[in-house]
């Protein structure tokens, strides 16, 4: 069934019904050079063939030039993310030219019509870039197109149509409907710029996916798996507004891509790292925290150029707000025996203790099942920098947290009524930090006591022999 979309109807209806009553207007695209960090400043409008505004408004031919391209609009006004992004670019790149591509009249239409207008707008941008290329010292290599939602595909068209190759395109949650699975010349793709990096924050495998699911760049980054963004759940939205709606959730998750990019501009000292992985499930298992062979990268503005032969899907976890950076850890727990496990999977929590801080109690997400006589890998992440890890507390939760687990426990009891206590043996935990690439091994405090059972905890300290595998470092990322 269709996803509801607030009090005004369903999501599908929103895609086909702009709020404005339309009148016949000539299609128009404007280029506004943002000459001030003050969002209220009117800036300077540039037009092909007119050199005077370039001089009057101090367009810097040798500097970087950013083109910000908005997406489909229901209101016909620039949304608030725009001036946040403009301001962040001005802060980070003081000499740069920041140009807003205003295609509101063509975007404030039925979604399907707006999609059909993306090609025209891409052409307009390409014409502007071709004209600028005629000027001395202007280089396409210094051009960075930043497109949000439908604007990402506009950027793709612009990169495709321009004479030459633009330096970079960043796609901020490129639009999904009518682009998913489309031919590479009808959507953003790696051949549209020298470097195409993409952030996917609202992808859905069910219902309507506002953002495109497929990889469309040289690197495609899927924060939090590219779907459910922290701080954007209905509960979070309900907490911040009197009557939260699905609309707010959609906006929050879709726009999260913009905020992650803004964060990368203004919180340069707190870079977020993403790690290459074949899929979200493997990442959740903690398998993919390597920086070898360009397998990790900064996200957003600080991303290092990678031109892979095929798309590189990368994943990371984030906080719910700026700064978004978290610290990722891979935990390898070797379970060498267990007793009377029954059907039910244990619920484990870890607390990490470091030289800088201690973590909260973190759940170990069991993606499939706990394997015995095998190494089980988990991903945990902390919001604070713990420093060097000193010890780990592993807790096996006692009482069942769900009716399903309770039922399984009850069934286990019926089949084995005199079931002795469930128990599991763990000697050591191997930990790898995603951010520093350091690996450490932690042993049980008491080598004689390696068993853990429901409601109990086990403490691990750095092994006495200081067992440490050689550090992996990445050539593409300056690790903090």
């Amino acid at each position: 069934s269709p996803v509801p979309f607030g009090p005004e109807g369903r999501l599908e209806d929103k895609l086909h019904k702009p709020k404005a009553t339309q009148t016949e207007v000539k299609p128009s695209v404007r280029f506004n050079l943002r000459t001030s960090k003050d969002p209220e400043h009117e800036g300077c409008y540039l037009s092909v063939g007119h050199s005077q505004p370039l001089e009057d408004c101090s367009f810097n031919m040798t500097a970087k030039t950013f083109f910000i391209i908005h997406g489909w609009t229901m209101s016909g006004i620039f949304e608030n993310w725009l001036h946040k992004l403009v301001s962040a670019l001005h802060t980070r790149e003081k000499d740069a030219n920041v140009v807003v591509v205003d295609w509101l009249p063509l975007a404030h239409q039925l979604y399907t019509d707006a999609v059909n207008n993306t090609r025209v707008v891409g052409h307009s941008i390409a014409r502007m870039l071709d004209w600028l290329q005629e000027k001395d010292d202007f280089s396409l290599g210094n051009v960075h197109l930043i497109g949000y939602s439908l604007g990402a595909h506009v950027a793709g068209y612009a990169g495709n149509f321009v004479k030459g190759t633009v330096g970079r395109i960043t796609g901020l949650d490129p639009a999904g409907p009518m682009f998913e699975g489309a031919d590479i010349h009808k959507r953003l793709s790696p051949d549209d710029a020298d470097f195409v990096d993409v952030l996917h924050t609202y992808t859905r495998s069910f219902g309507l996916s506002i953002g495109i699911q497929m990889p469309v760049g040289h690197i495609d980054i899927y924060p939090n798996g590219g779907d459910f963004q922290p701080g954007c759940g209905l509960n979070d939205v309900l907490g911040s507004i009197a009557y939260g709606t699905i609309t707010e959730v959609v906006k929050c998750e879709h726009e999260r891509a913009v905020h992650l990019f803004v964060d990368s501009l203004v919180n340069q000292d707190k870079p977020s790292f993403a790690f290459q992985c074949t899929d979200s499930n493997r990442f959740k298992k903690g398998i993919c925290l390597s920086c070898r062979k360009n397998r990790c990268n900064s996200i957003g503005y600080n991303a290092k150029k990678m031109r892979n032969k095929r798309n590189s899907k990368m994943y990371l976890k984030t906080r719910a707000g700026m700064p978004f950076r978290v610290y990722h850890y891979q935990m390898k727990i070797h379970v060498f025996s267990y007793k009377n496990m029954g059907e039910i999977e244990p619920t484990f929590y870890v607390t990490l203790y470091g030289t800088n801080a201690d973590s909260q109690t973190l759940p170990l997400e069991i993606v499939e099942r706990i394997e015995q006589n095998a190494t089980n890998t988990f991903l945990v992440y902390t919001e604070e920098d713990l420093g060097d890890l000193l010890k780990i507390q592993l807790t096996w939760e006692g009482a069942s947290q769900s009716w399903y687990n309770l039922w399984k426990e009850f069934r286990s009891y019926l089949s084995q009524p005199r079931n002795p206590g469930r128990e599991l043996n763990i000697r050591r935990i191997r930990v790898k930090s995603g951010e520093t690439q350091r690996k450490l091994t932690f042993c049980t405090e008491d080598p004689e006591n390696t068993s853990i059972s429901p409601g109990r905890e086990l403490w691990f300290r750095k092994c006495r022999d200081g067992w440490r595998m050689k550090n992996e470092t990445s050539p593409t990322v300056e690790l903090p």
Epitope: A20, S28, E40, E42, G76, E79, N80, P105, A242
Partner: antibody, heavy 120, light 112 residues
């Protein structure tokens, strides 16, 4: 200096049409959006909608869809509000007010207001 | 639509004292650290004049005795010290990026 100058007071009968003008000066007309706001006698302010002064695309608040029309004469830096099939409840002062496309959408300059009286 | 509720509907303040006007929104008007709440002053027979934008920023040419504060759903306009010429009706106005934009019901300030 920046000014929005509106046309004078109007006295109309129910069923008639009125067209109120708002002439802008002191800035580039097409670089700012234009709002229309209604204030009935002794009542609060009610946002009617806005028009994109570059593209001419109007957006109407729900209560002002149908009989109300925003238009432009860009060459004269003038925005218009037309109300068709006037009703007694249209009696009010109508203000035009500009806002920045790129900013936080507050209304920084207002016209002096046009008083419309609808009476048989 | 976001509903703005102003209180009190009217108040009388002595010259030189503080006037405090409250505006409560039916849902948050915040976005990424900014509050899209504005305040206007309207005197009889005149158009409204911008006093405060984005919750706490002073409009052009507005004296420093006017100040705004608040975030989320609760906002306040303070005038201190109140002067004779401040007798007017004050309106709050939300300008989030999802119109319709709405105004509060107004607060009439009288100087004693």
């Amino acid at each position: 200096q920046i000014q929005l100058v509106q046309s004078g007071p109007e006295l109309k009968k129910p069923g008639e049409t009125v067209k109120i003008s708002c002439k802008a000066s002191g800035y580039t007309f097409t670089n700012y959006g234009m709002n229309w706001v209604k204030q009935a006698p002794g009542k609060d302010l009610k946002w009617m909608g806005w028009i994109n002064t570059y593209s001419g695309v109007p957006t109407y608040a729900d209560d002002f869809k149908g009989r109300f029309a925003f238009s432009l004469e860009t060459s004269a830096s003038t925005a218009y509000l037309q109300i068709n099939n006037l009703k007694n409840e249209d009696t009010a002062t109508y203000f035009c007010a500009r806002f920045s496309y790129y900013g936080r959408h507050y209304f920084d300059y207002w016209g002096q207001g046009t008083t419309l009286t609808v009476s048989s | 639509d976001i509903v703005l509720t102003q209180s009190p509907a009217s108040l009388a303040v002595s010259l030189g004292q503080r006037a405090t006007i409250s505006c409560k929104a039916s849902q948050s008007v915040d976005y990424d650290g900014d509050s899209y709440m504005n305040w206007y002053q309207q005197k009889p027979g005149q158009p409204p004049q911008l006093l405060i934008y984005a919750a706490s920023n002073l409009g052009s040419g507005i004296p420093a005795r006017f100040s705004g504060s608040g975030s989320g759903t609760d906002f306040t306009l303070n005038i201190h010290p109140v002067e004779e010429e401040d007798a007017a009706t004050y309106y709050c106005h939300q300008s989030t990026d999802d119109p319709p934009w709405t105004f509060g019901g107004g607060t009439k300030l009288e100087i004693k």
